[in-house]
């Protein structure tokens, strides 16, 4: 007799990543009877919300509902109606909202309040909106990539089903770059984690992990650029800032009030004799790199070794997945290939930054100028952060894998967050059943 398919017994979950520059909605799906198995949850949809990050709505909170509508309606379409009521929705806000909360807890709460009000109008099971900590952001990113890479699975395979898989159970480190913060998370080799704030202990699938993590607030690519501009304008002789991190011929007017709006530039704030200044690009990688290095204080370290700003960092260990803006920027620059050495990356960046702005605009006519203009800075910043900030070397560069997706799911903190909040990562290894559940009878 012919096998007959039973109705699909699946569950869905939604996580909104409310980042500093934009919000993305992710829909995840998994077989209901395999919740505790590793690697069964996968992403079925990503919807990028049109507009800026939610922290920018602080003076227009009434617009948040409209802002979220398209992606929430998309979720309504993707998830079967019969599942709507059962589908959990979580919103996690990251460093953009951490910065807003530093300025005003009341304003941050007002934004989250309106987010809840808006999301409660949908048929899903809204679980909460909150600002996640930098430590959580690092930890959940680490869980996501290792879950997707099959590192928590006890089954050893003689063949590889996942890219980057080295067929061992050594976990990958996680490098996450956002607009307002950056995270580094990995399991150090037999090294004591000297600062308790940077130590995490997990028991996942019957195995203990001692994990190092740190989130550098204000060192995401957008806030790092604001920091650099605030630092450099201090020593400018007039309202012209000749900037090596922008292409030759590029010009942009910046309001001083915008520059000092963020808590990230407070340490560089001074009274300037002008309200605006003009950035004039000169496109010099080496000078740009030198200017960026001034953002990292490496003169002080109360531990055996540090990253920068007195933050403990153990010796790097194993392979690393670099995702979010690490990936997007390097992908744009065509530098994500495993075959490209660090020296080659530096060489390509030198050439790219030196290209005249008019030429760049012609070559990348489809790219918004706001984003296009910042790739020279962002690429240089990534190199500076990885090499001087985190102490990668030309040799260890090959251990960095620039990852966008793993098996169709985006690398990032959202999957790990949902797995944790829905209790889908057991502390102990689930008992294997003699027969796997079959979809067919």
């Amino acid at each position: 007799t012919q096998n007959k398919a039973l109705p699909e017994n699946v569950k869905y979950g939604i996580v909104l990543d409310a980042g500093s520059s934009h919000t993305s909605l992710y829909i995840y799906k998994w077989p209901a009877e395999k919740e505790n198995d590793t690697g069964v949850v996968h992403q079925v949809e990503e919807c990028r919300v049109k507009g800026p990050g939610i922290s920018k709505f602080v003076q227009k909170v009434n617009e948040i509902g409209i802002y979220l509508t398209d992606c929430m309606e998309r979720a309504r379409e993707v998830i079967p109606r019969s599942q709507h009521q059962e589908t959990p929705v979580y919103l996690g806000a990251t460093a953009g909202m951490r910065l807003l909360r530093m300025e005003s807890e009341e304003l941050a709460d007002r934004v989250l309040d309106v987010v809840e009000r808006s999301l409660s109008n949908y048929p899903f099971d809204f679980q909460g909106a909150r600002i996640i900590t930098g430590q959580e952001e690092g930890a959940y990113g680490w869980i996501t990539i290792n879950y997707l890479l099959g590192k928590f699975s006890q089954k050893t395979r003689w063949f590889s089903i996942v890219p980057y898989e080295t067929n061992n159970q050594e976990t990958f480190g996680a490098l996450d770059l956002g607009g307002a913060s950056t995270q580094v998370t990995f399991v150090p080799q037999n090294q004591t984690i000297e600062s308790p704030d940077n130590a995490l202990q997990f028991r996942l699938y019957g195995k203990d992990y001692n994990v190092y993590t740190h989130s550098f607030l204000c060192y995401g690519k957008d806030q790092a650029l604001w920091q650099k501009l605030a630092k450099d304008i201090q020593v400018a002789s007039n309202e012209i800032l000749r900037d090596p991190c922008f292409h030759p011929g590029y010009k942009k007017v910046v309001n001083v009030s915008d520059l000092y709006k963020t808590p990230c530039t407070k340490r560089f704030e001074m009274t300037l004799p002008f309200q605006q200044f003009e950035i004039q690009g000169i496109g010099n990688y080496q000078q740009c790199h030198q200017s960026i290095l001034e953002l990292f204080n490496t003169s002080y370290c109360p531990y055996s070794q540090c990253a920068f700003n007195g933050i403990f960092l153990p010796p790097l260990q194993g392979d690393f997945g670099a995702f979010s803006a690490f990936y997007f920027v390097m992908k744009f620059l065509n530098l994500t290939s495993e075959k490209v050495s660090q020296e080659k990356v530096t060489e390509m960046m030198k050439k790219f930054c030196a290209q005249p702005w008019e030429e760049i605009k012609t070559s990348y006519a489809g790219v918004k100028e706001k984003y296009l203009s910042e790739y020279c800075f962002s690429g240089t910043y990534i190199l500076s952060l990885l090499l001087q900030g985190y102490h990668f070397t030309a040799d260890s560069w090959e251990h960095i894998h620039f990852i966008g997706k793993i098996q169709g799911s985006d690398a990032g903190w959202t999957l790990g967050y949902m797995l944790n909040l829905t209790n889908m990562i057991p502390a102990e290894q689930p008992l294997s059943t003699p027969l796997s559940h079959s979809t067919y009878v």
Epitope: Y90, L112, D113, E116, R117, S120, F126, Q127, R130
Partner: nanobody, 126 residues
Amino acid sequence: QVQLQESGGGLVQAGGSLRLACTVSRGTFSEYSMGWFRQAPGQERDFVTAISGFGHITHYADSVKGRFTISRDNAANTVYLQMNTLKPEDTAVYYCAAAWQTSPRRMMQMAGSITWGQGTQVTVSS
């Protein structure tokens, strides 16, 4: 881990009103859905009502709809239960409950990890 402290219980005549309060210490209050459950002598602990982190979602047991109102003041880290038109069958120990990043609907199902207060006695005399 959050800690919960109820207050406001007591003896009241049928048809009267009472307001219970539950103050939360530790944790970020807005990250928790808050709820009230009750347990009459010899009975199971039953769901009464729950409210989401910023108060936009509420659920009530059918037996209290229209009589009881849950509210919260996030600035004061406090959740309230206003009980009107009280009946003798409302007599029970009332427990405050907190559940982190859990919907009021899931609290109603007693799903997820719930932290409990020590309870406050409400007695409604006829």
